[in-house]
């Protein structure tokens, strides 16, 4: 419903960290926003992390979440940590304007995150 923009491709760092911006076009004056990161593989969709925040306040994920983020206006800067090669896939940003009514929901087209496991260091004779 809402327009949600996110980059098409992101390469994770060698430490398994990937960051991208999720931007939404708000039709109204939402004060409470929920952002969810979904991972889609074939026809399976799994929730990676989610956070609800009040406009003007910081984005707070659960303590054990692999995600962190900051918000600024209608932009959310998302960071996913602890990624490994097997986590390579399409990560979709879902934004919901929770309060006040009306409820709006928007789905981004997804960001393909590529994760390359670092090569193990060769044994050294020094």
């Amino acid at each position: 419903a809402m327009h949600v923009a996110q980059p098409a491709v992101v390469l994770a760092s060698s430490r398994g960290i990937a960051s991208f911006v999720c931007e939404y076009a708000s039709p109204g004056k939402a004060t409470e926003v929920r952002v969810t990161v979904l991972r889609q593989a074939d026809s399976q969709v799994t929730e990676v992390c989610a956070a609800t925040y009040m406009m003007g306040n910081e984005l707070t994920f659960l303590d054990d979440s692999i995600c962190t983020g900051t918000s600024s206006g209608n932009q959310v800067n998302l960071t996913i940590q602890g990624l490994r090669a097997m986590d390579t896939g399409l990560y979709i940003c879902k934004v919901e304007l929770m309060y006040p009514p009306p409820y709006y929901l928007g789905i981004g087209n997804g960001t393909q995150i590529y994760v390359i496991d670092p090569e193990p260091c060769p044994d050294s004779d020094f």
Partner: antibody, heavy 115, light 108 residues
Framework: EVQLVESGGGLVQPGRSLRLSCTAS????????MNWVRQAPGKGLEWVAQ??????????YYSDSVKGRFTISRDDSKSIAYLQMNSLKTEDTAVYYC??????WGQGTTVTVSS | DIQMTQSPSSLSASVGDRVTITCGAS??????LNWYQQKPGKVPKLLIY???NLADGVPSRFSGSGSGTDFTLTISSLQPEDVATYYC??????????FGGGTKVEIK
């Protein structure tokens, strides 16, 4: 208190036109995407049309069954949404509901298309 | 267009029973789904939005679950006032915002 009041329904012959109005109060009309949903006698709900708001350039969308015949519009200064229905068919007979987002619903207005 | 398939089309259950209604989408809709209740002769009322969120004033015996393509509306303990027809609706852009065919719930 949120109110949506539909008007303009009635009995009309096939091929003729009718314009429905939806007057809103009790909420910020300009923040809402407005929809029309209809329900034929004894049948289920059918989404008909949607008009978005200014941040979305007042984009409009229609169900295939009414595309080219119905036109949705809005006047934010008056908090009114409209549904202009042309070339009416007997299968357009239904109760027409106006909705704000999908959160708020009006009481509906009955449109009967019959010769 | 994405099709929404609701089942069953009708059911009869006793007061206090747990009632489950399912709604399937022909494509992934990421939780972009609402549930409505329409009592006989009345206007439809929003029950659940975004697949899982309870609308204001809706009793806690109603709950929604699901993601992807398969969704469920559950009434944990059916009450006489729950006699109604229940509809799911896809709210993912682009429209059409298709409704399911409806499930009529009656008391045994």
């Amino acid at each position: 208190e949120v109110q949506l009041v539909e008007s303009g329904g009635g009995l009309v012959q096939p091929g003729r036109s009718l314009r429905l109005s939806c007057t809103a109060s009790g909420f910020t009309f300009s923040d809402n995407w407005m929809n029309w949903v209809r329900q034929a006698p004894g049948k289920g709900l059918e989404w008909v049309a949607q008009i978005r708001n200014k941040p979305y350039n007042y984009e409009t969308y229609y169900s295939d069954s009414v595309k080219g015949r119905f036109t949705i519009s809005r006047d934010d200064s008056k908090s009114i949404a409209y549904l202009q229905m042309n070339s009416l068919k007997t299968e357009d007979t239904a109760v027409y509901y106006c909705t704000g987002g999908m959160d708020y619903w009006g009481q509906g207005t009955t449109v009967t298309v019959s010769s | 267009d994405i099709q929404m398939t609701q089942s069953p089309s009708s059911l009869s259950a006793s007061v206090g029973d747990r009632v489950t209604i399912t709604c399937g989408a022909s494509e992934i809709i990421y939780g972009a789904l609402n549930w409505y209740q329409q009592k006989p002769g009345k206007v439809p009322k929003l029950l659940i939005y975004g697949a899982t969120n309870l609308a204001d004033g809706v009793p806690s015996r109603f709950s929604g679950s699901g993601s992807g393509t398969d969704f469920t509306l559950t009434i944990s303990s059916l009450q006489p006032e729950d006699v109604a027809t229940y509809y799911c609706q896809k709210i993912l852009s682009p429209p059409p915002w298709t409704f399911g065919g409806g499930t009529k719930v009656e008391i045994k």
